[in-house]
């Protein structure tokens, strides 16, 4: 697995440099997330063809992924900064649930989806600093999720396939929506 | 385990009209989305149509408002209704169901866990 932000070599090399503000960490924990998921999506693509046909082979999707709309503030039309920081802090704490799905599912990226896992979970503790109104954030109920979790495993080898297809592709998206959203924070 | 038997295959004139049935054994149908498959001779199983467990109709386009699939759970049966029939429909039609409560509704064979035997359609012109 890649070393964490805050751990590579260059940080020892250079031990003078100024420390990361605030903001500076969380985008780069954010960018490091993006590239376990670039390296798990990389295994499943190969693993089957889901990522080129799973457009039109789904009719219904239940999963219920957390997704940016207009009405969370995080675009630039309607931009919210509190509205917008509730709502990616939300969503990720619904992503944890999807995220400890995943675990299972990498045969040659099993370190990598462990990362992702514990580095969104560091992310998240970033993000509750950063928010003025934690009041404001629902966390899931862990009884549903434990129940989701059953249901996402029940399915059939092919479904699961195409659930960790799914769940990839919308943390991606979910997670650069946040990052341009925090670039203007 | 799940059983799924198709009734109401047979031969038709162009323009004319079948009804498929279903019958699935089993108490949990309810939960299951169930779907139609068909397979004309040295072709792939293609596709028909599927109804979810929520109760959302989907087609494939060749068959939009000719085909409709209904699902009566009181009686562990799905339906499927085929007006306007072409000679391109002609086939073995099957039944399909998913294990219980599945989050992704798919029309790839892959997504379905239990078969029946299938039933054939004939349209002659």
């Known amino acids: 697995a890649p070393v964490p932000p805050g751990e590579d070599s260059k940080d020892v090399a250079a031990p003078h440099r100024q420390p990361l503000t605030s903001s500076e960490r969380i985008d780069k924990q954010i960018r490091y997330i993006l590239d376990g998921i670039s390296a798990l999506r990389k295994e499943t693509c190969n693993k089957s063809n889901m990522c080129e046909s799973s457009k039109e082979a789904l009719a219904e999707n239940n999963l219920n992924l957390p997704k940016m709309a207009e009405k969370d503030g995080c675009f630039q039309s309607g931009f919210n900064e509190e509205t917008c920081l509730v709502k990616i802090i939300t969503g990720l704490l619904e992503f944890e649930v999807y995220l400890e799905y995943l675990q299972n599912r990498f045969e040659s990226s099993e370190e990598q989806a462990r990362a992702v896992q514990m580095s969104t979970k560091v992310l998240i503790q970033f993000l509750q600093k950063k928010a003025k109104n934690l009041d404001a954030i629902t966390t899931p109920d862990p009884t549903t999720n434990a129940s989701l979790l059953t249901k996402l495993q029940a399915q059939n080898q092919w479904l699961q396939d195409m659930t960790t297809h799914l769940i990839l592709r919308s943390f991606k998206e979910f997670l650069q929506s946040s990052l341009r959203a925090l670039r203007q924070m | 385990q799940v059983q799924l038997a198709e009734t109401g295959g047979g031969s038709v004139q162009a323009g004319g009209s079948l009804t498929l049935s279903c019958a699935a054994s089993g108490r949990t149908f309810s939960s299951r989305a169930m779907g139609w498959f068909r397979q004309a001779p040295g072709k792939e199983r293609e596709f028909v149509a599927v109804?979810?467990?929520?109760?959302?109709?989907y087609y494939t386009d060749s068959v939009k408002g000719r085909f409709t699939i209904s699902r009566d759970d009181a009686k562990n049966t799905v339906y499927l209704q085929m007006n306007s029939l072409k000679p391109e429909d002609t086939a073995v039609y099957y039944c399909?169901?998913?294990?219980?409560?599945?989050?992704?509704?798919?029309?790839?064979?892959?997504?379905?866990?239990?078969w029946g035997q299938g039933t054939q359609v004939t349209v002659s012109s």
């Open positions: 399909a169901a998913t294990s219980e409560h599945v989050m992704l509704v798919v029309t790839t064979r892959g997504g379905y866990d239990y």
């Open positions: 109804i979810s467990w929520t109760g959302s109709p």
